[in-house]
């Protein structure tokens, strides 16, 4: 049951983060122009990796894109290819983690197998947390040279007599959304991580637990008719005995190929 | 159609105080911002004041800041100057002005009401 | 503060000439976000209330005939009258609509010879 939760809550958790590391690549506030200490533009200046957007006081707001990739700053790129590399194996690991969930049965699909793809989709996802975080990072770091380079200079000369305004950017919007959301799927990530580890089955045999019966001594173990398989059956956490054995979340099992009492 | 309609104009001492109001009808006033311009007797236009469509930003000249107060109530449809320690210099006529939903351009002009600062 | 300054302070055409009057502005007013110049002309005819002509230093309010047009950009304009018309005759006045505080240039005045 614990196994189950973890692992839907680590996908759950994962889609938040997902939706929020394509939402922040989408969003148009990575930058926001700083009001505080700065001339008072009568129009509110804010850029994303895609386009730069201006509102003005009516309310209207016009965006241009950035209609060339050779012009643009690398570090913006590397922003850019962080953040879609985040949402591409994001998405992957959304699409194998559906699959890899407890509750969802395909056909006869081995419990090994949905272990291996919960523990594939997390280390997708845990990547992917760390794409956007780092991606976000590149950016704010960015920003912050930018603002002390400008804040240095704020009115740039042009040919000793004509001042130009030196609009400062401050954090956006998108930055918090990017941190929040790369959090998010790294946790997701490593939550499906530990659930790989409870969906695992056993390769080796159970510990024995033994039932003394009148005459004779018969040692079972936990699994039923298949505990000498090395695979046991019980994979739905159930009592298979009234008779005290536990189950197999209750008892932990170590290498040891007889371990009759 | 668009109107704006100043009052509260007229004759009065340096150091007085005077409040115009502007009345606007023809479109949703509280969704526009809101400007004061004037202009001396035989000079150039000069801008006042600014105010925002949620009151939010205000903004005044330097040579106002301190002395004029704009507001505005968006019940009432109406824009107003507050204007105290009048000076010779504020003589003007106070034009009450839309900013328009383009370009911060000023659109729609009212035909002014004459402040008139002496002694 | 920004200030604008308009040249010639006044000019005397014909009647179908084209005219060109100039605004410089201490700063620039281009935005590099929507990549427009924060730059308004307006038309002031006597004994009536300023019109608002053009905006984002090019574009025309609606209602203004084509023969008006503006150019330039950061920090040097230009309003251009094709075939000047008697109706024409007004003092024509550029603002700084950038920057607080907004500031107008101190005028053009035209007149017909």
């Known amino acids: 049951m614990a196994v189950t939760a973890c692992q839907g809550l680590g996908f759950v958790v994962s889609l938040i983060g997902i939706a929020g590391i394509i939402a922040a690549t989408c969003m148009d506030q990575w930058s926001t122009q700083d009001l505080y200490n700065n001339p008072v533009t009568a129009v509110f200046n804010y850029q994303g990796l895609w386009r730069s957007c201006v509102r003005e006081s009516s309310g209207f707001t016009e965006c241009r894109g950035y209609f060339t990739l050779l012009g643009l700053p690398a570090m913006l790129q590397a922003v850019r290819a962080l953040m879609i590399v985040g949402i591409v194996l994001g998405a992957i690991g959304l699409l194998v983690s559906i699959f890899a969930l407890k509750c969802i049965r395909i056909g006869s699909m081995e419990d090994s197998a949905k272990a291996n793809m919960t523990l594939t989709s997390g280390i997708m996802f845990i990547v992917s947390g760390l794409c956007a975080i780092a991606g976000v990072s590149v950016f704010a770091n960015m920003l912050v040279t930018n603002f002390w380079m400008s804040t240095a200079n704020m009115y740039t000369g042009m040919g000793g007599m004509v001042q130009t305004v030196q609009t400062r950017y401050t954090f956006g919007a998108a930055l918090f959304v990017g941190w929040v959301a790369g959090g998010l799927t790294l946790i997701g990530g490593v939550m499906m991580c530990i659930a790989c580890r409870g969906l695992a089955p056993e390769e080796t045999n159970y510990k024995a637990v033994s039932y003394h019966a009148s005459g004779h001594s018969v040692a079972y173990k936990p699994g039923g008719f298949k505990a000498s398989t090395g695979f046991g059956s019980n994979t739905k956490n159930k009592k298979i005995y009234d008779g005290g054995a536990r189950t197999e979340d209750e008892v932990q099992s170590y290498p040891s190929k007889h371990d009759y009492v | 159609e668009v109107q704006l309609v100043e009052s509260g104009g007229g004759l009065v001492q340096p150091g007085g105080s005077l409040r115009l109001s502007c009345a606007v009808s023809g479109f949703t006033f509280s969704s526009f911002g809101m400007h004061w311009v004037r202009q001396a007797p035989g000079k150039g236009l000069e801008w006042v004041a600014y105010i925002s469509s949620g009151t939010t930003n205000i903004y005044y000249a330097d040579s106002v800041k301190g002395r004029f107060t704009v507001s505005r109530d968006n019940a009432k449809n109406s824009l107003y100057l507050q204007m105290n320690s009048l000076r010779a210099e504020d003589t003007a006529v106070y034009y009450c002005?839309?900013?328009?939903?383009?370009?911060?351009?000023?659109?729609?002009w009212g035909q002014g009401t004459l402040v008139t600062v002496s002694s | 503060d920004i200030v604008m300054t308009q040249s010639p302070d006044s000019l005397a055409v014909s009647l179908g000439e084209r005219v060109t009057m100039n605004c410089k502005s201490s700063q620039s007013l281009f935005s590099s976000g929507n990549q427009r110049n924060y730059l308004t002309w307006y038309q002031q005819k006597p004994g009536q209330p300023p019109k608002l002509l053009i905006y984002w230093a090019s574009t025309r309010e609606s209602g203004v005939p084509d023969r008006f047009s503006g150019s330039g950009s950061g920090t040097d304009f230009t309003l251009t009258i094709s075939s000047v018309q008697a109706e024409d005759v007004a003092v024509y006045y550029c603002q700084n609509v950038y920057i607080y505080p907004l500031t107008f240039g101190q005028g053009t005045k035209l007149e017909i010879k």
């Open positions: 002005v839309r900013s328009g939903y383009y370009g911060q351009s000023l659109d729609y």
